[in-house]
């Protein structure tokens, strides 16, 4: 079999709050029941993990309570929210998809989305 | 269905050679990262060594640089692992895993992974 495909937009600019949304979307080669997505940040050959969630088919993602990223699925969709995000934060994200159940097992990994993110200039201080 | 079959593992006295094998089938892409990763028992899995199909280039961890060399036979869809001046260290089970990337992605990077084989057993002892 050929690798899963998995489709997200090249490139998404941060909102002046430091929000960046994309779509993560992937061909299932089969009719998966449990998938795991996960959000990798490569920037300079380097690759971190930002966010992980498992879901069943039909209901919602759950990140972990701390993690910076919210989502929600539809089909073979997932919407992906990441907040708190900062200058220093940009980079290349890439979405890895999992087909975790039932098996056979299949893998695919996005080509990324360059997220540019650019810190507000502060306020000048008012007269008023 | 991707498949990764290993061989070559066993016991070997230290300073001994060992020769790993990895077959793959089932994918058909020709962009792909394949390689070697160890799990000695309480420790987490490590890479080891691995090669990208397309370019060659390899990856090695600081603690087998010099000792072991991995290569790829693309025609046979397998890559080779050979192990030389091998240390207790050493023992662990050794995994073929591979990484559908794409030139974007950064060569042999963990996170990339998923796909993986059985395993082979390989003792390092006197």
């Known amino acids: 079999c050929k690798a899963m495909h998995v489709a997200q937009p090249a490139v998404v600019l941060a909102s002046s709050r430091g929000i960046a949304s994309f779509v993560c979307e992937y061909a299932s080669p089969g009719k998966a029941t449990e998938v795991r997505v996960t959000v990798l940040r490569q920037a300079d050959s380097q690759v971190t993990e930002v966010c992980a969630a498992t879901y069943m088919m039909g209901n919602e993602l759950t990140f972990l309570d701390d993690s910076i990223c919210t989502g929600t699925s539809s089909g073979n969709q997932v919407n992906l929210t990441i907040q708190g995000l900062r200058a220093m934060d940009t980079g290349l994200y890439i979405c890895k998809v999992e087909l975790m159940y039932p098996p056979p097992y299949y893998l695919g990994i996005g080509n990324g989305t360059q997220i540019y993110v650019i810190d507000p200039e502060p306020c000048p201080d008012s007269d008023f | 269905e991707v498949q990764l079959v290993e061989s070559g593992g066993g016991l070997v006295q230290p300073g001994g050679s060992l020769r790993l094998s990895c077959a793959a089938s089932?994918?058909?892409?020709?962009?792909?990262?394949i390689g070697w990763f160890r799990q000695a028992p309480e420790k987490e899995r490590e890479m080891v060594s691995c090669?990208?199909?397309?370019?060659?280039?390899?990856k090695y961890a600081d603690s087998v640089k010099g000792r072991f060399t991995i290569s790829r036979d693309n025609s046979k869809n397998t890559v080779y692992l050979q192990m030389n001046s091998l240390r207790a260290e050493d023992t662990a089970v050794y995994y073929c895993?591979?990484?559908?990337?794409?030139?974007?992605?950064?060569?042999?990077?963990?996170?990339?992974?998923?796909?993986w084989g059985q395993g082979t057993r390989v003792t390092v002892s006197s």
């Open positions: 089932g994918f058909s892409s020709d962009y792909y990262d």
């Open positions: 090669i990208r199909s397309s370019g060659g280039s390899t």
């Open positions: 895993g591979l990484a559908p990337i794409s030139p974007v992605h950064a060569v042999c990077n963990q996170h990339y992974f998923g796909y």
